[in-house]
């Protein structure tokens, strides 16, 4: 039975040209995290595998950095980066947990962080 929950940074905003950290945290389970995938819509941005380490998609290498932790840092943001991002936690023995973050990249200098929320 899957008892864990994913806590994410929720709905966030950032300035064009700036950077943002996408962060998820798996709690309420003793399952072992074996791999975390970061996806934007249907595109795989990066994987952090417990055995093999990080692999960043070459298409995003110049603008995506691993970490901190299991999170992902997006740099040199453009308005095209606005959209949904997913952290997909592969665990043993539970299976897969998915968290969602919505990022809005703003032209203006006003960029507020949304409240944290949980996805079961």
């Amino acid at each position: 039975m899957m008892t864990g929950t994913i806590e994410t940074t929720g709905n966030i905003s950032a300035e064009k040209g700036g950077s943002i950290i996408l962060q998820c945290h798996l709690s309420s389970t003793t399952a072992q995290v074996t791999q975390v995938n970061w996806e934007q819509q249907d595109q795989l941005l990066a994987i952090c595998n417990a055995d093999l380490g990080w692999h960043i998609s070459p298409s995003f290498k110049d603008r995506v950095a691993p970490g901190p932790g299991l999170g992902l840092t997006l740099q040199s943001l453009t308005v095209n980066d606005t959209g949904e991002y997913f952290c997909i936690y592969h665990t043993y023995p539970d299976g897969t947990y998915t968290g969602r973050i919505f990022l809005e990249v703003l032209e203006s200098s006003v960029a507020e962080h949304g409240a944290r929320f949980q996805i079961p």
Epitope: T34, Q35, L44, I47, N49, A50, D51, L52, G53, H55, I56, S57, P58, K61, H90, Y92, G95, T96
Partner: antibody, heavy 117, light 107 residues
Amino acid sequence: EVQLQESGPGLVKPSETLSLTCAVSGYSISSGYDWHWIRQPPGKGLEWIGFIRDSGSTVYNPSLKGRITISHDTSKNQFSLKLSSVTAADTAVYYCARGLFWYFDVWGQGTTVTVSS
Amino acid sequence: DIQMTQSPSSLSASVGDRVTITCRTSENIFSYLAWYQQKPGKVPKLLIYNTKTLAEGVPSRFSGSGSGTDFTLTISSLQPEDVATYYCQHHYGNPLTFGQGTKLEIK
């Protein structure tokens, strides 16, 4: 078009060190992907050896760890394998390959290495 | 280590036949399975990754399915140029491992 080409001595004596190089053309090895070595003993299946990242960090097959060193030379756009204390069991065709999320999308032609005195 | 077991180890089929090769893993690898084709005397070629995604230039008669521990490579209509040995490989942990291969021949 990305191309990989292995080179190195075809014959190595037992207990010596096998040294191979993979020259990459059509893509900069410092621009992403992982760069792997895989081998295939005569008439047998494939065995993954290890890889080097564009950053220079390495991951090795635990069954060979301690005998393997993978390094790269970004100025020459090539990466290399050293396998120490070889025995006849290390006789194989050695392939270099480009890795994307740990599967292999481009392979070199392979080079045959025989371990014999 | 994740063990990869392919079956059958060899098979013979006729041109136009539907051919199925299976790969079973010793533990859950989710969808992280690739298939390669190695023609006699040639270099392995990536056919499929992430269980079902066809690599660039691979004919649509090849398809992959499965998840967890059981996976299948299917050739919908066997062609003479499909004579080869086929290998599965998980791309999920260290060490990366391959199946022992399935040798496919034409009757």
